[in-house]
Interface confidence: low
């Protein structure tokens, strides 16, 4: 797994996502580069080392690491996009609503994609929790529908206009990530000028019977305190030329990365620029909702 072997192999071999990001730095060891960047940054802060702040550490979502692993090991699975953004569910207070075998999960995303970019693909990633009796071998069969909650045009706030984005089925035997394509919706959102968008996930029994202990349960993990928070992954292309990309990349590396260290947790560098440091730095590029991945 590339994530597990960051120190063992050169950046160029592992980072298929960043195929030409560091091409102008051939022969430069990334650890050395990172160390010198850290030293420069510390110098400007008049510090000799980075203070430990365990509580500030932010782990990238599990799926983003899986995504990195997937693209790093299989280049063909990478969509033809040069930017990847992830957006976390920001509805931290709503609870799932349950009745007659139907469960509704409200989700909220703040999505901002510059107008000059072309959205290649967008995926809603949901972590499905399969809860069943261990003695029951069968999986859990469910219908799933992703709705977009549209702004109400009428006076009655109780009336909500819901648009079906994706419908499908899940046959779950294990808790795992499920992917739903929401490209059309994200393209609309990009044009709309509004950044806050509400989705609702409906899960219902496939055979119209109410859920019971014998058939097991399938739920969406919406808890914000873990790595399984619903994610919106947007793959886009900024249409700029390779030359512009490289110039922008160099600028991003020299200017954008270091000021964002506080978002990552400065303690990630305290043990030296090892595996964790690289992971944190890379996860910043891959995960921060405004950060960009370049190919």
């Amino acid at each position: 797994s590339p994530i597990m072997n960051l120190e063992q192999s050169p950046l160029e071999e592992d980072m298929s996502l960043f195929g030409d990001v560091f091409s102008e730095q051939d022969g430069v060891d990334f650890n050395t580069l990172l160390q010198s960047m850290k030293d420069e940054f510390l110098k400007t802060l008049n510090l000799s080392d980075i203070p430990t702040q365990d509580s500030a550490k932010v782990d990238p979502p599990e799926y983003m690491l899986e995504l990195y692993n997937k693209f790093a090991t299989d280049r063909t699975s990478m969509p033809s996009a040069n930017i990847i953004r992830s957006f976390k569910n920001e509805d931290l207070f709503s609870q799932p609503v349950s009745f007659n075998g139907l469960r509704k999960y409200p989700l909220l995303f703040n999505v901002s994609i510059p107008h000059h970019e072309e959205v290649i693909m967008a995926e809603l990633r949901l972590y499905t929790l399969v809860q069943r009796d261990r003695m029951i071998y069968d999986g859990v069969d469910r219908k799933i529908t992703i709705f977009e909650v549209l702004e109400s045009k009428g006076d009655n706030e109780g009336e909500r206009n819901m648009l079906v984005l994706v419908s499908g089925e899940i046959y779950g035997t294990n808790s795992e990530w499920e992917t739903f394509d929401v490209t059309d919706a994200i393209r609309r959102w990009q044009k709309s000028g509004s950044s806050t968008h509400q989705l609702e996930v409906h899960i219902e029994s496939k055979h119209d019977e109410a859920e019971d202990a014998s058939s097991g349960r399938l739920e969406i993990d919406t808890s914000a305190q873990n790595k399984h928070n619903p994610l919106l992954i947007v793959f886009s292309d900024d249409q700029s030329s390779d030359k512009e990309r490289k110039e922008e990349l160099n600028e991003m590396i020299s200017h954008e990365q270091l000021p964002e260290l506080d978002n990552l947790g400065l303690d990630s560098f305290s043990s030296g620029p090892g595996e964790e440091a690289l992971l944190q730095m890379r996860s910043n590029i891959i995960y921060d909702s405004t950060a960009r991945i370049r190919r």
């Epitope: 063909t76 290649i120 994706v166 499908g168 394509d181």
Partner: antibody, heavy 116, light 112 residues
Framework: SLEESGGRLVTPGTALTVTCTVS????????MSWVRQAPGEGLEWIGS?????ITWYASWAKGRFTISKTSTTVDLRISSPTTEDTATYFC??????????????WGQGTPVTVSS | DIVMTQTPASVEAAVGGTVTINCQAS??????LAWYQQKPGQPPKLLIY???KLESGVPSRFKGSGSGTQFTLTINDLECDDAATYYC??????????????FGGGTEVVVK
């Protein structure tokens, strides 16, 4: 645009590959499908391939048909044709919706005749 | 398997009249349904997607409605050029969904 080719007269059991050549379409971003139509009959979906090279097929077509692609072509291989496979084979670009789609662009089709 | 059933198999109407074509899914497919028009010797042409959304360039005389399992294509102010065979197609589900054929059997529209 989409252009099918490779349709011809074959004898039963002789493998055949029909090809869809695309222009102006990035196959790494699109869902591509094969649909056939027997003479005087309706449309019959065979299978699809998406931008991640994932393929899926109609329940009746599994094992008999194989879809693959390059950067500019999408191939449909019929492993062991029977007379029932005589049809016009259409290549179509799908507007992707959760591993499926509706078809906004079609080729003109290529006729395949299976006869002894 | 999801099965799409289209009725009637054939319908005849006069110029200026109205034609209604029905499509029934063997299970709920939400609004994930498209309608196509096909003329002899030509490939199908997309008319409607999302059960009711008109494809760009298609006259507003074509109207799609319905959701779940029952869908309807209505052609108003019938013109000679509308003589064709019309097909419905579902695109419900994903990799795991099994289709015998996501297309309906077709409805031939004859314009008098």
């Amino acid at each position: 645009s989409l252009e099918e080719s490779g349709g011809r007269l074959v004898t039963p059991g002789t493998a055949l590959t029909v090809t869809c050549t695309v222009s102006g379409i990035d196959l790494s971003r699109n869902l591509m499908s094969w649909v056939r139509q027997a003479p005087g009959e309706g449309l019959e979906w065979i299978g699809s391939i998406n931008f991640r090279n994932i393929t899926w097929y109609a329940s009746w077509a599994k094992g008999r048909f194989t879809i693959s692609k390059t950067s500019t072509t999408v191939d449909l291989r019929i492993s062991s044709p029977t007379t029932e496979d005589t049809a016009t084979y259409f290549c179509a670009r799908g507007v992707y919706v959760n591993s499926n789609g509706y078809y906004s662009l079609w080729g003109q089709g290529t006729p395949v005749t299976v006869s002894s | 398997d999801i099965v799409m059933t289209q009725t009637p198999a054939s319908v005849e109407a006069a110029v200026g009249g109205t034609v209604t074509i029905n499509c029934q899914a063997s299970q709920s497919v939400s609004n994930l349904l498209a309608w196509y028009q096909q003329k002899p010797g030509q490939p199908p042409k997309l008319l409607i997607y999302g059960a009711s959304k008109l494809e760009s360039g298609v006259p507003s005389r074509f109207k799609g409605s319905g959701s779940g399992t029952q869908f309807t294509l209505t052609i108003n102010d019938l013109e000679c050029d509308d003589a064709a065979t019309y097909y419905c197609q579902t695109y419900w589900g994903g990799d795991g969904t099994s289709y015998l054929n996501p297309f309906g059997g077709g409805t031939e529209v004859v314009v008098k």
